[in-house]
Amino acid sequence: EAHKSEIAHRYNDLGEQHFKGLVLIAFSQYLQKCSYDEHAKLVQEVTDFAKTCVADESAANCDKSLHTLFGDKLCAIPNLRENYGELADCCTKQEPERNECFLQHKDDNPSLPPFERPEAEAMCTSFKENPTTFMGHYLHEVARRHPYFYAPELLYYAEQYNEILTQCCAEADKESCLTPKLDGVKEKALVSSVRQRMKCSSMQKFGERAFKAWAVARLSQTFPNADFAEITKLATDLTKVNKECCHGDLLECADDRAELAKYMCENQATISSKLQTCCDKPLLKKAHCLSEVEHDTMPADLPAIAADFVEDQEVCKNYAEAKDVFLGTFLYEYSRRHPDYSVSLLLRLAKKYEATLEKCCAEANPPACYGTVLAEFQPLVEEPKNLVKTNCDLYEKLGEYGFQNAILVRYTQKAPQVSTPTLVEAARNLGRVGTKCCTLPEDQRLPCVEDYLSAILNRVCLLHEKTPVSEHVTKCCSGSLVERRPCFSALTVDETYVPKEFKAETFTFHSDICTLPEKEKQIKKQTALAELVKHKPKATAEQLKTVMDDFAQFLDTCCKAADKDTCFSTEGPNLVTRCKDALA
């Protein structure tokens, strides 16, 4: 229904706390360089204005759209051109072009320093002094680094953060209470960020239809007892929520997400038997819980998929009459029977089925042509299954760090033109799939591995889009989202690449490496490994292992030495010589 004042409507629906949090996230995601204080001032002004509209919906400007109100605020920021360059040109446009322009200027890799966590005591002090400001800083810092973070979910993580601080700051040993808990939240939030970015990419590149197909598959796996009409309704609503968030309409997105959660909890009987625990929780926890609820038990009496989609005499008639609906029912029926498949795989199967019908239904004898379609799925299913087996075996053999290194070598060979920091970040993220997925039960491994890899590779594509350097990467990133992972997996050594000159300074280290945290040490070593591969793309695994073992030994020796600096300056050049010889 239409409201006289959109801003008053959203303020009333969301309440002041969530309203302010979402406006802060929106501003931080649009203008990623502004300080917290600048954004906090704008948020307060918007909130004060919203309150005047709540008091009187006919007050001046209360009838304006949220994009107009927010855009006007952002465009009024002083020194916009100096700080943001051509983004300032957006302000010469009218809505809706102005908002589209802001969206196009979101930076997936802003040049901001890593979000450093303060020391426990300091954190607790500032949290106790002003919890609201503390949480505001958290929202601002995460949102500006992750401009597509799912806003209502970021409110959930802020709430988690708040609860952890409340609990741990009351403990004697704050540090040991906070560190593992906050690390856990950080890890989950980073995964949430890449997953959501993938959804927005799907929406931006391929439109609502592509996202809705993803949603149908995912929801059908989770709710196999819900009928097709129910799944379609949920998928349509979920598509709207994600479209709004990806489009920067964060107030509408959060409001509609709350509505969807409410609907699901009011209709558990027709959706799933597993929702009650989630539905007992307060709003943010409820919506989060529903988004990752366990799969319902599959109905026992499901007929073979072939009955309706291969053997039925009316396959081509049904397909021709309502292609999207027929393919949707195929995706629904296949997905509800296969919680053990990844969504990407299910979408590839649906695509194969569609291509088969397009070809066969135009022929003289369609049933003879499409009769073998299910058998033709086999190679498509085997490929990711083999990928999971091979990679999980390797992970179990090497551990996370070793597995990351194996992936780093593999991907540097596939795309040696890509910058070393991007390759290291990608390999570290791809390597985490082992820890995340390989320990799961067999039937959960494939969906976990492939859907996570797809999300990470989406980030690789986004970073590469900014500065395209590798034809291999461009080729894989240009195709459909669901084909990306198989495309990257199939890449081999780039034969067109001219090896990098060997530069001794690339492999020269100093004693400061000794005091770095373990993660930073690993990154330094992985940076060296990527550079080695760029110098010798065809080096064997054995050669690289020899060099890296030598390198590790060198670091260990010099970091234990009484005179570290002397050790690094004398042993370093020897290491470089040995490396060159080993790779000759």
Epitope: E314, K317, Y319, A320, E321, A322, V325, E358, C361, A362
Partner: nanobody, 123 residues
Amino acid sequence: EVQLVESGGGEVQPGGSLRLSCAASGFTFSTSGMVWVRQAPGKGLEWVSTISDDARITVYAESVKGRFTISRDNAKNTVYLQMNSLRAEDTAVYYCATYRAGSRIGSYEDYYRGQGTLVTVKP
């Protein structure tokens, strides 16, 4: 709103021909499959033929195969049914139809339909 207007019906002798037309509006015609169904006096709806959105796929009921031809012109938002070698049993009201969101595929009572055009085949 969705509108389907059939025309071209009439009285014809057995063995004769007619060409039915259906002008569509109120929906995205070029992405919609189209259907002809018919209803003989005192009978239920019977499916006759279906054509896909891009006209690549055409399907016919056994009773009309080889005699009827379905076609469409997406530029004119029109679907046609060319009926040759007409028989007495082809006498019916012919409806042009398209899928309605939320209905079951093949459940023609629930599809969007026009008012129909009467085809009478008699000596």
